[in-house]
Interface confidence: medium
């Protein structure tokens, strides 16, 4: 079952993920979407980084933390009650079938 | 070419007001985060104000706290830093510094302005 | 809150290897950013996410953060870096930015 979070109409939802990086600077890719996490990727991406930086983002959505150390919590600025559902964060680790992944439930008030 | 250029600084008596702006250019100003950034003359660096891509989140450091306030009009691509009830100490250059993409604070200072001069003085 | 320590000056022969450390608890756990600042101009990123380094910054700067010690290292010192160096985080307690108090690279 998903872990739920809950933020309140006009505020910022916070929903934590993490990873241990295996060395410093040696990033997985990482993928946030909206919906439970499929097979592979994430469905409906609202951010994504790769091995160096964040390279895709849409309005509102932000990484929260540090995530060069492995902090990739986002950020949902200003919400609505349309931002409630389930979130999908994806440790891309590298491999078959070794991706971790994280499903959010986000209760909007 | 990304550019941002402070305006607003002038010679100011203690307990006055001024506002500072920062014009940007060369990217999309509303997804990132930008902060004002501020040096007394041959003193160090000292972060200020900070505020999200969409304005709806700011921060402020302790010292500025309740006296200034930052702001942002994304459809004139333009950082505000309001100033009252000025005091000596707030003497410095103030400089505005976009942060990096997709982060929610901004995390390093990519790009930095020329800035402008505050003098607090009677 | 995170205090940042750095040594006021550090001086060096042309061609040689400067080091400017930047102290604060746990400096490791988070991601360090250094900036280069030349008399009566504005700063300038050399090194971002510890030992990144922007495009247009040469080879020779490389930064490294463990422990409780960020360094930044400036590789066969040439006179236009003659400067000040101040380190950065971010502090998630107080979601404040963090400066040291600069460093100034004499090149001697």
């Known amino acids: 079952s998903e872990v739920e979070y809950r933020a309140e109409v006009g505020q910022n939802a916070y929903l934590p993920c993490f990873y241990t990086p295996a060395a410093p600077g040696n990033l997985v890719p990482v993928c946030w979407g909206k919906g439970a996490c499929p097979v592979f990727e994430c469905g409906n991406v609202v951010l994504r980084t790769d091995e160096r930086d964040v390279n895709y983002w849409t309005s509102r959505y932000w990484l929260n933390g540090d995530f060069r150390k492995g902090d990739v919590s986002l950020t949902i600025e200003n919400v609505t009650l349309a931002d409630s559902g389930i979130y999908c964060c994806r440790i891309q680790i590298p491999g078959i079938m070794n991706d971790e992944k994280f499903n959010l439930k986000l209760v909007i008030k | 070419e990304v550019q941002l250029l402070e305006s607003g600084g002038g010679l100011v008596q203690p307990g006055g007001s001024l506002r500072l702006s920062c014009a940007a250019s060369g990217f999309t100003f509303s997804s990132y985060a930008m902060s004002w950034v501020r040096q007394a003359p041959g003193k160090c660096l000292e972060w200020v104000s900070a505020i999200s891509g969409s304005g709806g989140s700011t921060y402020y450091a302790d010292s500025v706290k309740g006296r200034f306030t930052i702001s942002r009009d994304n459809s004139k691509n333009t950082l505000y830093l309001q100033m009252n009830s000025l005091r000596a100490e707030d003497t410095a250059v103030y400089y505005c510094a976009r942060g990096s993409y997709g982060t929610y604070y901004g995390n390093y200072f990519e790009y930095w302005g020329r800035g402008t001069l505050v003098t607090v003085s009677s | 809150q995170t205090v940042l320590t750095q040594p006021p000056s550090v001086s060096v022969a042309p061609g040689k290897t400067a080091s400017i450390s930047c102290g604060g608890d746990?400096?490791?756990?988070?991601?360090v950013h250094w900036y280069q600042q030349k008399p009566g101009q504005a700063p300038v990123l050399v090194i971002y996410?510890?030992?990144d380094r922007p495009s247009g910054i040469p080879q020779r700067f490389s930064g490294s953060n463990s422990g409780n010690t960020a360094t930044l290292t400036i590789h066969r010192v040439e006179a236009g870096d003659e400067a000040d160096y101040y380190c950065?985080?971010?502090?998630?307690?107080?979601?404040?930015?963090?400066f040291g108090c600069g460093t100034k690279l004499t090149v001697l």
């Open positions: 950065q985080v971010l502090d998630r307690r107080s979601d404040h930015w963090l």
């Open positions: 746990n400096i490791g756990g988070k991601s």
């Open positions: 996410y510890d030992s």
